[in-house]
């Protein structure tokens, strides 16, 4: 347990269309140094949902202040959920590298299912 673990406590989350989905993720250590990213799906075809280091993700907000010293909470909230957002989301820790950061460890994933908007 000395090595960093990526904790995604919920195995599944169900959200009504139009609502926001909170996907929780925590690290157990500040080491190694490097950014976290969120992906939907696994493998080569996975879709980048959020990159702590760079990029513009208008529907994604972080739940805590990621620049805060000693922060270990990397949860995100995705607004205005639609059925197209269903899938398994992975919180992934990268180790700082040169020239590119290297994937270090992934969380177990959280399966997001989308319910029809209540009428």
């Amino acid at each position: 347990e000395d090595e960093l673990q990526v904790i995604q406590p919920e195995k599944s989350v169900s959200v009504a269309a139009g609502e926001s989905a909170t996907l929780r993720c925590a690290m157990t250590s500040l080491i190694p140094v490097g950014p976290i990213m969120w992906f939907r799906g696994a493998g080569a075809g996975r879709e980048l949902i959020y990159n702590q280091k760079e990029g513009h993700f208008p529907r994604v907000t972080t739940v805590s202040e990621l620049t805060k010293r000693n922060n270990l909470d990397f949860s995100i909230s995705i607004s205005n959920i639609t059925p197209a957002d269903a899938g398994t989301y992975y919180c992934v820790k990268f180790r700082k590298g040169s020239p590119d950061d290297v994937e270090f460890k992934s969380g177990a994933g959280t399966e997001l299912s989308v319910r029809a908007k209540p009428s």
């Epitope: 904790i7 406590p9 195995k11 925590a26 157990t28 270990l72």
Partner: antibody
């Protein structure tokens, strides 16, 4: 090595409250879930609720909603479970359990016997 | 809430025999299922996580299988210390739930 040490046995009157503590040592406290599980005499295991200290908010089983409060103090690496409006059926051993690397209750406290009797 | 039903309630076997314990979920929990062992006066001990992975320090005679709604814990050859109560548990959805337990007793 992760260790969970719980507070001692309690005898309570019906209608009163009890607060059980669970002090963790070893490993990271903030990021792992701590659950509270109870076991009535001769019965099975019953999940009451749990908390991940870094997130602050707790999840509770419907059966205990409104009667149980689970909190965590990151500064002392201690989790607490308070159960109110006690009745005789609440007589049980109360365990705290902490997740390990794979999000299951891996480390368990020694248990705290709570007896509710008039 | 996801209900976990364990069978049989009691299993009477002799040391050296094979034990097969069943856990059925009221809805799919994917492969998110754990098995715990509990002896009298002791806290439960995690044996299997994610349906088929042995926890640290658990002997190879314990194995788990299944996914979706049907799961099995197998003890290939019972040792005297294996006589205990076994519980399945799902962390797939809140509230987390346990099965009612299977007692493995000496015949």
């Amino acid at each position: 090595q992760v260790q969970l040490v719980q507070s001692g046995a309690e005898v309570k009157k019906p209608g009163s409250s009890v607060k059980v503590s669970c002090k963790a040592s070893g490993g990271t406290f903030s990021s792992y879930a701590i659950s509270w599980v109870r076991q009535a005499p001769g019965q099975g295991l019953e999940w009451m609720g749990g908390i991940i200290p870094i997130f602050g908010t707790a999840n509770y089983a419907q059966k205990f909603q409104g009667r149980v409060t689970i909190t965590a103090d990151e500064s002392t690496s201690t989790a607490y479970m308070e159960l109110s409006s006690l009745r005789s059926e609440d007589t049980a051993v109360y365990y705290c359990a902490r997740d390990g690397s794979y999000s299951y209750a891996t480390y368990w406290g020694q248990g705290t016997l709570v007896t509710v009797s008039s | 809430e996801i209900v976990l039903t364990q069978s049989p309630a009691t299993l009477s076997l002799s040391p050296g025999e094979r034990a097969t314990l069943s856990c059925r979920a009221s809805q799919s929990v994917s492969s998110y299922l754990a098995w715990y062992q509990q002896k009298p006066g002791q806290a439960p001990r995690l044996l299997i996580y994610d349906a088929s992975n042995r926890a640290t320090g658990i002997p190879a005679r314990f194995s788990g299988s299944g996914s979706g709604t049907d799961f099995t814990l197998t003890i290939s050859s019972l040792e005297p210390e294996d006589f205990a109560v076994y519980y399945c548990q799902q962390p797939y959805n809140f509230p987390l739930t346990f099965g009612g337990g299977t007692k493995v007793e000496i015949k």
